[in-house]
Amino acid sequence: KETAFVEVVLFESSPSGDYTTYTTGLTGRFSRAGATLSAEGEIVQMHPLGLCNNNDEEDLYEYGWVGVVKLEQPELDPKPCLTVLGKAKRAVQRGATAVIFDVSENPEAIDQLNQGSEDPLKRPVVYVKGADAIKLMNIVNKQKVARARIQHRPPRQPTEYFDM
């Protein structure tokens, strides 16, 4: 299970005329459910239940985007409509170039994502937890536009990280 290096860039408008960008670095793990590839795109926050409805044609968003899913405690969703792997597949079907799961509340999901699948997804499926997950969700919950860049090597130049 390789380390996934994730850079998240948050965009904010400023009266001066250009955009202020805040870059945060965090690490996760590439799961066996997907490919160990670099990917990047706009972050789209997806509620686990939002992945349940099945009208895939209407729900295709064709630009490369990175789905971020915060998994809930298993007790809160004892009979999920889809497995964690099923949720990843559904996001990729809808156009996601990568999926990042926050598994802090549901660590069992790590094993589910790492069970050797005979047909792994062709896009990366990354999981984050602990302090890295908190950093990621703090940005995502701001409801501003953010982009994620996932790499399987550390970023070449040192990034200036802002504490979000």
């Epitope: 860039v9 965009f11 795109g41 789209v44 064709e62 536009v145």
Partner: antibody, heavy 118, light 110 residues
Framework: QVQLKESGPGLVQPTQTLSLTCTVS????????VSWVRQPPGKGLEWIAA???????YYNSGLKSRLSISRDTSKSQVFLKMNSLQTEDTAMYFC????????????WGQGVMVTVSS | DIVLTQSPALAVSLGQRATISCKTN??????????MHWYQQKRGQQPKLLIY???NLASGIPARFSGRGSGTDFTLTIDPVATDDTATYYC?????????FGAGTKLELK
């Protein structure tokens, strides 16, 4: 400061190929998407093609068979080739940058007027 | 392709409110975001981004401009209108490829 500048021929013969260049400064092509958008005289805006930071290419399906978009990151340039030009391709051609979303154009060049005529 | 419909022209008195509408033939929302944007184009100039994702003010744009709407119905409001606002205003969707624009609404001062 973000800047985009288009260059190319002002006049093209019908059936010929149009080659346009967009030179950008103030941002990197590896963190932005650049699109080409055109505007016939007195008319509205039409998106033509885009190349993303990850080098994904997107084309207007109605024009796709005639188009090619590429880039040279070392020179900060994006290129558009459009073949089999007709008089209805006469338009102002803009390049536009999208740093926030792929085809949301937060910066624009001044445009280059292309006339297709014999 | 998603079709965007705008009324062609609007005349407003200086200092009054201008409301420009845009309707789409398909929903442009995706997971809580609304992929509708607004541009201003003055005669002989390139377009300029005003509003993105339905209601976010672009950098350097005065707060007189605001956007709202979701689904298929959207408005751009300019309040109060200034002399400098004479221009054509375009809505654009980026929910589906290809990104498409409305035909534009020409704003004139009475």
């Amino acid at each position: 400061q973000v800047q985009l500048k288009e260059s190319g021929p002002g006049l093209v013969q019908p059936t010929q190929t149009l080659s346009l260049t967009c030179t950008v400064s103030g941002f990197s092509l590896t963190s932005s998407t650049v699109s080409w958008v055109r505007q016939p005289p007195g008319k509205g805006l039409e998106w033509i093609a885009a190349i993303s930071s990850a080098e994904n290419t997107y084309y207007n399906s109605g024009l796709k068979s005639r188009l090619s978009i590429s880039r040279d990151t070392s020179k900060s340039q994006v290129f558009l080739k459009m073949n089999s030009l007709q008089t209805e391709d006469t338009a102002m051609y803009f390049c536009a940058g999208g740093r926030i979303l792929e085809t949301l154009f937060d910066s624009w060049g001044q445009g280059v007027m292309v006339t297709v005529s014999s | 392709d998603i079709v965007l419909t705008q009324s062609p022209a609007l005349a407003v008195s200086l200092g009054q409110r201008a409301t420009i509408s845009c309707k789409t033939n398909q929903n442009v929302d995706f997971y809580g975001k609304t992929y509708m944007h607004w541009y201003q184009q003055k005669r002989g100039q390139q377009p300029k981004l005003l509003i993105y994702l339905a209601s976010n003010l672009a950098s350097g744009i005065p707060a007189r401009f605001s956007g709202r709407g979701s689904g298929t119905d959207f408005t751009l409001t300019i309040d109060p209108v200034a002399t400098d606002d004479t221009a054509t205003y375009y809505c654009q969707q980026t929910r589906s490829l290809p990104p498409t624009f409305g035909a534009g609404t020409k704003l004139e001062l009475k």
